[in-house]
């Protein structure tokens, strides 16, 4: 696993890798918080779940997600964070066997139990933004990002490249 600063380095080094999306290039445990430093917490049972976006109590440990990094199998002409036209994608897992999924119909972010190979809905193109922030773009719906709406995670359509820096789709990854 590598630190946050290593994301950019690793992105640049992608062309050294022959892995093309079947297996992750690397995996990394990180806590996920919003641009405004609210924590993302996953309350997960067998048959139900809730995802909290809130200020965390001082004495509480932050939840972590397992980010698995993949190199996109399909070259992209879009200006992403890939190298040589390939893009860096991630899956996000808060606990064993569960992954975040994009439900484009409902514009919602969901948790689903599934086995590998994971469906496309579980993959997000990783964008490195300013101030050490990242954003997660749906593989299945370009231009749609994981974002925060009414203290919940939701899918948010970004109309233009200027809006890529809108705070509600920016997240921070931290090792602590």
């Amino acid at each position: 696993a590598f630190g946050i600063s290593g994301v950019q380095k690793y992105t640049r080094a992608l062309h050294d890798s022959s892995i093309t999306g079947i297996s992750p290039i690397t995996e990394y445990l990180a806590s996920l918080s919003t641009y405004n430093d609210q924590s993302i917490t996953f309350a997960l049972e067998d048959e139900s779940y809730e995802i909290y976006v809130e200020d965390l109590k001082k004495d509480e440990k932050k939840d972590k997600v397992l980010l698995s990094y993949y190199e996109s199998q399909h070259p992209s002409n879009e200006s992403g964070d890939g190298v040589d036209g390939k893009m860096l994608m991630v899956t996000l897992s808060p606990t064993k066997d569960f992954w975040l999924h994009a439900n484009n119909k409902e514009h919602s972010v969901e948790l689903h139990k599934c086995e590998k190979p994971l469906p496309d809905q579980a993959f997000f193109v990783l964008h490195n933004m300013h101030s050490n922030c990242v954003s997660f773009e749906c593989k299945t719906d370009p231009g749609v990002f994981i974002g925060v709406k009414d203290n919940h995670l939701a899918l948010i359509k970004v109309d233009s490249s200027e809006n890529l820096c809108t705070e509600n789709i920016l997240f921070k990854l931290s090792e602590t």
Epitope: L44, K57, K58, T95, K96
Partner: antibody
């Protein structure tokens, strides 16, 4: 439906040993941390011990450290508490409890006790 | 070791509001849970994460937590609410319970 069924309680002499079991059903057992909580007759609740979903991490109250051992067999969906060097003050109803939520990668004891068994009585007396 | 202090007993008339306090150092920096235990029965979680109610728990149960005190409030108390109530937090990878409060509905 989540079910937790304790067994193994009984009368034991001071210095003796006893092994409690908790059979779990209705949920993915290996995904949840589990705990033992006890209640002496007429007294309040006291947390005793906990174990992570994989069994790789264990936690104990100071009052039982070195004497009690918590373990689990995920293939049998069963939680255990091995109690050695028992004392009169260990007399209590012992409850098995499941964390409300599945363990996050960060681990540790963090969640409330969402489900409880019916308890098994342990009496330590000569 | 970390100590949570509850009043031993609280009395309330039917339909009135019962408030049970749970005091501990910097309590508001932790998430509090509350359990109800009726005679001869196992405890039941009634409040978690300070304010949240599990499904099946009536709306008359509510919680708050700030400073050094967490509070469980039972609004419109009913005879069936007569029970022992325990607060609980996690501290340094251990579970810590308060001593319990017996709620009597007069």
């Amino acid at each position: 439906e989540v079910q937790l069924l304790e067994s193994g309680g009984g009368l034991v002499q001071p210095g003796g040993s006893l092994r409690l079991s908790c059979a779990a059903s209705g949920f993915t057992f290996s995904s949840y941390a589990m705990s033992w909580v006890r209640q002496a007759p007429g007294k309040g609740l006291e947390w005793v011990s906990a174990i992570s979903g994989s069994g790789g991490s264990t936690y104990y109250a100071d009052s039982v450290k070195g004497r009690f051992t918590i373990s689990r067999d995920n293939s049998k969906n069963t939680l255990y508490l091995q109690m050695n060097s028992l004392r009169a003050e260990d007399t209590a109803v012992y409850y098995c409890a499941r964390d409300l939520w599945m363990e996050n990668w960060v681990g540790g004891l963090r969640y409330p006790f969402g489900y409880w068994g019916q308890g098994t009585m342990v009496t330590v007396s000569s | 070791s970390y100590v949570l202090t509850q009043p031993p007993s609280v009395s309330v008339s039917p339909g009135q509001t019962a408030s049970i306090t749970c005091s501990g150092e910097r309590m508001g920096d932790k998430y509090a849970a509350w359990y109800q235990q009726k005679p001869g029965q196992s405890p039941v979680l009634v409040i978690y994460r300070d304010t949240k109610r599990p499904s099946g728990i009536p709306e008359r149960f509510s919680g708050s937590n700030s400073g050094n005190t967490a509070t469980l409030t039972i609004s419109g108390t009913q005879a069936m609410d007569e029970a022992d109530y325990y607060c609980e937090v996690k501290k340094s990878d251990t579970g810590v319970f308060g001593g319990g409060t017996k709620v009597t509905v007069l």
